[in-house]
């Protein structure tokens, strides 16, 4: 006879799994808010700043009520990957003005990366279909000026803040339905 069977694989408690993801998301949300406030203090900027390469915001009126877990996690992962790429780009090409936001931008990048790995783990633990590998994204053009880099930073941090809020609200709402 072969070796005795191993212990049965414990299926994860989806609420606990979601919980730890929400925790990381909330923590990153607080970091992002703080960094955005720091940026506003150093480089005040009026009005909304947009960057065409950023993902469009995930939520529209009424959409939260119809959310399903696979859709939320897939969309969130795709959007956060884009933000990670933009934060990396900002650190590399943002110019000397944005060096004043280090080491905080570096910490934000590391935490964003950690949340992405956590989402990947959650999706595999919950046996959700894995999204296909992302096609290589075209490189982001360097900002045209120092002020262009600052405007981009406002857009990136503002968009990330809203995306993380959408994520926390969506994930907590889904948790109530589990």
């Amino acid at each position: 006879p072969g070796p005795p069977p191993g212990p049965p694989r414990v299926s994860p408690d989806p609420r606990a799994e979601l919980d730890s993801t929400v925790l990381l998301t909330r923590s990153l949300l607080a970091d992002t808010r703080q960094l955005a406030a720091q940026l506003r203090d150093k480089f005040p900027a009026d009005g909304d700043h947009n960057l065409d390469s950023l993902p469009t915001l995930a939520m529209s009126a009424g959409a939260l009520g119809a959310l399903q877990l696979p859709g939320v996690l897939t969309r969130l992962r795709a959007d956060l990957l884009s933000y990670l790429r933009h934060v990396q780009w900002l650190r590399r090409a943002g110019g000397s003005s944005l060096k004043t936001l280090e080491p905080e931008l570096g910490t934000l990048q590391a935490r964003l990366d950690r949340l992405l790995r956590r989402l990947q783990l959650l999706m595999s633990r919950l046996a959700l279909p894995q999204p296909p590998p992302d096609p290589p994204a075209p490189p982001l053009a360097p900002p045209s000026s120092a002020w262009g880099g600052i405007r981009a930073a406002h857009a990136i941090l503002g968009g990330l803040h809203l995306t993380l809020d959408w994520a926390v609200r969506g994930l907590l709402l889904l948790k109530t339905r589990l």
């Epitope: 909330r26 949300l29 939520m59 009126a61 809020d165 959408w166 609200r169 907590l172 709402l173």
Partner: antibody
């Protein structure tokens, strides 16, 4: 000065609807969520739901799902709460409150709108 | 939903005394480093006012005599030396999960 100013008191019949407004000033309207809280006489405060003014997506306490509708007019920096199929238990003071994104604590409150439901 | 129980229901103290208000949650509202409990003060005919957020952070414009502490399921609001204007009703609120809920309140009265 950061302020939330709500519409005036309302008296409604059972089965009717009421729509309360909340005008924000002194801050960037889209930087915070707008939450709504009910305070009925002798009852604890009750969270109704919130809305993200930037994206317009509301979420509700299950207790109020289907009867409360939260909307915003970004251009007017105004949030609205409509409550339908009113009953006597809806008699309360309703507050709008500015909510920190993702954390649900409320650092600025409107003055409250009294809604009385009576036949 | 998480239930918050405040004690005592009412408390009579004199100006200058120390007030200790308690809030107990039906399950833990803390997760590594964050405690999702907030405290408000409400006076008759007025809206609530945020005093403390995330268990121990003083809200803007709130006097330093107010402080918050605790983790897990047990939290405390302390007023180190009561002033006349502190006599009011105090509520705790959690935001650990949806929906956020409030305690039933502690009424602080002048002795």
């Amino acid at each position: 000065e950061v302020q939330l100013v709500q519409s005036g008191a309302e008296v409604k019949k059972p089965g009717a609807s009421v729509k309360i407004s909340c005008k924000a000033s002194g801050y960037t309207f889209t930087d915070y969520n707008m939450d709504w809280v009910k305070q009925a006489p002798g009852q604890r405060l009750e969270w109704i739901g919130d809305i993200n003014p930037h994206q317009g997506g509301p979420i509700y306490n299950q207790k109020f799902t289907g009867r409360a509708t939260l909307t915003v007019d970004k251009s007017a920096s105004t949030a609205y709460m409509e409550l339908s199929s009113l009953r006597s238990e809806d008699t309360a003071v309703y507050y709008c409150a500015r909510g920190e994104l993702g954390h649900w604590y409320f650092d600025v409150w409107g003055q409250g709108t009294t809604v009385t439901v009576s036949s | 939903d998480i239930v918050l129980t405040q004690s005592p229901a009412s408390l009579a103290l004199s100006p200058g005394e120390r007030a200790t208000l308690s809030c107990r949650a039906s399950k833990s509202v803390s997760t590594s480093g964050y405690s999702y409990i907030h405290w408000y003060q409400q006076k008759p005919g007025q809206a609530p006012r945020l005093l403390i957020y995330l268990a121990s952070n003083l809200a803007s414009g709130v006097p330093a005599r107010f402080s918050g502490s605790g983790s897990g399921t047990d939290f405390t609001l302390t007023i180190s030396s009561l002033e006349e204007e502190d006599f009011a009703t105090y509520y705790c609120q959690h935001s650990r999960d949806l929906p956020p809920t409030f305690g039933q309140g502690t009424k602080l009265e002048i002795k």
